[in-house]
Interface confidence: low
């Protein structure tokens, strides 16, 4: 089996071979690329914290688990992992923390077994709508992806394109309906202000959805109705003020769901009554005894489960003549 790179395979700083569409493997694809460590027994290649600027062309054909973390890849072009012969067994690809700011259309094409993809901790200013689908067809060939990890991919404010970051990410998730088989989607820590209306309806196979540590204020226009397989929904550390009746009913109707709602600034006024009633009855919310009010001031740190309808009042709306600017 291949062993950690020996001095015989010294790293060349000149650009590795790239064909126009498919990078050709060496005729013997079972070697270990320079600056990587390989275990054929574990079917694993690790090219970690090596400041690689490109994906190695000479990845061994046996690779199932590929770690390309902590590098300086900048751009993933179309066919970045396309090889001859193809990397037919590659199932798990981790590209986290590799300074990617652009992922182009078809970047993950020719990976027929790719089930897990982690792009976390990359400042993705430009994520092509066709990064995961590979083509701009209205219906693409199904992607084999089952897990897509996109935590903390939001770029710094000054590097964002003149468009909605949420919209850019969702466009990539929905293009060509390629991700119909996706079971786990992690979108934590992305400063999301909202979740576009149709996104979840088009990901019907989801089992696990992580939206924690975003800036979601409301789920009013988000429908969970189609997510009949959903097992976990992480909404911790957002800006949620209240969950309304429609959302509560949809969540309650999901047979396997566990919802995580910690550390949201719940507003404990009259609009919270339905949610409090639901919390007292439901078993779907994990750690529901930890949920506390943030507003109004008089209610701060009160436990939601301990509230009753008398506690949840709204200040009367002043008649127009008494309103001040």
């Amino acid at each position: 089996s291949s062993s950690p790179t020996s001095s015989a395979s010294s790293f060349s700083s000149s650009a590795p071979f790239l064909a126009s569409a498919v990078s050709a493997q060496p005729p013997l694809p079972d070697q270990c690329p320079a600056l990587c460590e390989c275990s054929e027994a574990a079917r694993t290649v690790k090219c970690v914290n090596r400041n690689l600027t490109e994906v190695p062309t000479d990845l061994p054909a046996y690779v199932r688990n590929l770690f390309l973390t902590g590098n300086q890849l900048a751009v993933l072009p179309a066919g970045a992992f396309a090889r001859r012969p193809p990397l037919a067994e590659l199932a798990a690809l981790n590209l986290s923390g590799s300074r990617l700011d652009e992922v182009r259309a078809g970047a993950f094409e020719h990976l027929p077994s790719l089930r897990q993809l982690d792009l976390s901790h990359n400042p993705l200013a430009d994520l092509s709508p066709f990064a995961f689908s590979g083509s701009n067809a209205s219906v693409s060939a199904p992607s084999p992806l089952v897990e897509l990890i996109l935590n903390h991919i939001v770029p710094p404010e000054d590097e964002r394109q003149n468009r909605s970051f949420e919209g850019m990410v969702v466009a990539a998730l929905l293009a060509g309906r390629a991700l119909q088989g996706l079971r786990r989607l992690e979108l934590a820590s992305n400063h999301f202000l909202y979740l576009p209306r149709d996104v979840l309806a088009q990901l019907p196979s989801l089992r696990h959805l992580d939206l924690s540590n975003n800036s979601l204020v409301s789920l009013t226009y988000v429908s969970f109705r189609n997510l009949t397989h959903l097992e976990s929904l992480h909404l911790e550390d957002n800006a949620l003020k209240v969950l309304h009746n429609g959302t509560l009913a949809e969540l309650q109707g999901l047979p396997h769901i566990r919802v995580f709602l910690d550390n949201n600034p719940w507003v404990c006024d009259c609009h919270m009554a339905d949610m409090v009633t639901w919390l007292k009855e439901t078993e779907v919310v994990q750690g529901k005894d930890r949920l506390t009010c943030a507003y109004p001031e008089k209610m701060r740190n009160r436990v939601l489960l301990e509230l009753n309808s008398a506690d949840l009042d709204c200040d009367p709306i002043l008649p127009p003549s008494l309103q001040t600017s």
Partner: antibody
């Protein structure tokens, strides 16, 4: 003793076909890739094609793509090169050689003696 | 395709001479370069693989080295049986390509 023995060469008219065989012995056939390399009279070496140890993947030089087919029968420890639509410029000694898949960039470490293919009318 | 430009195309040397043959790849081929010796009417024989690794059974007077995309085959002290044609070959990317060959003749 490792041996590769080519056979099947001969004189053929332009547009004709030939099938070359490469019989391997003395090593575990399924652990190696097999390449075909040719050498026109008085010229240098030209790579033609290769097949992986499982037989699941093949690759060809542009000059023969669509005309030549490489295959292998692991039960017989034999690789084949089916050559169709032969041209005068295909005239050469054809060698099969093995590539050690367990060594990084190993090179073609054993070669057959070669078989001459002559395409002429 | 990756071109392997080999030089010189021929050279004359005497027994005992130090001989150097070079090959330049048109783009990065990592260390995926091999060197072969071929005598008239015979199949090529592998001398060096992975740019600098001496193949089993090859005399130690043969050596290979790499500097970026430049590869060198050195025969430290030429012997009578070394008069032959030498080829470099890259196996980094398909199509596999060979250098044009260097014929080493007796001076």
């Amino acid at each position: 003793e490792v041996q590769l023995v080519e056979s099947g060469g001969g004189l053929v008219q332009p547009g004709g076909s030939l099938r070359l065989s490469c019989a391997a012995s003395g090593f575990t056939f399924s652990s190696y890739y097999i390449h075909w390399v040719r050498q026109a009279p008085g010229k240098g070496l030209e790579w033609v094609a290769y097949i992986t140890s499982t037989g699941s993947y093949t690759e060809y030089a542009d000059s023969v793509k669509g005309r030549f087919t490489i295959s292998a029968d692991t039960s017989k420890n034999t690789a084949y090169l089916q050559m169709n639509s032969l041209r005068a410029e295909d005239t050469a000694v054809y060698y099969c050689a093995r590539y050690d898949r367990s060594t990084r960039y190993s090179g073609l470490d054993y070669w057959g003696q070669g078989t001459l293919v002559t395409v002429s009318s | 395709d990756i071109q392997m430009t080999q030089s010189p195309s021929s050279l004359s040397a005497s027994v005992g001479d130090r001989v150097t043959i070079t090959c330049r790849a048109s783009q990065s081929v990592s260390s995926a370069v091999a060197w072969y010796q071929q005598k008239p009417g015979k199949a090529p024989k592998l001398l060096i693989y992975s740019a600098s690794s001496l193949y089993s059974g090859v005399p130690s007077r043969f050596s290979g080295s790499r500097s970026g995309t430049d590869f060198t085959l050195t025969i430290s002290s030429l012997q009578p049986e070394d008069f032959a044609t030498y080829y470099c070959q890259q196996a980094y990317a398909t199509p596999v390509t060979f250098g044009q060959g260097t014929k080493v003749e007796i001076k």
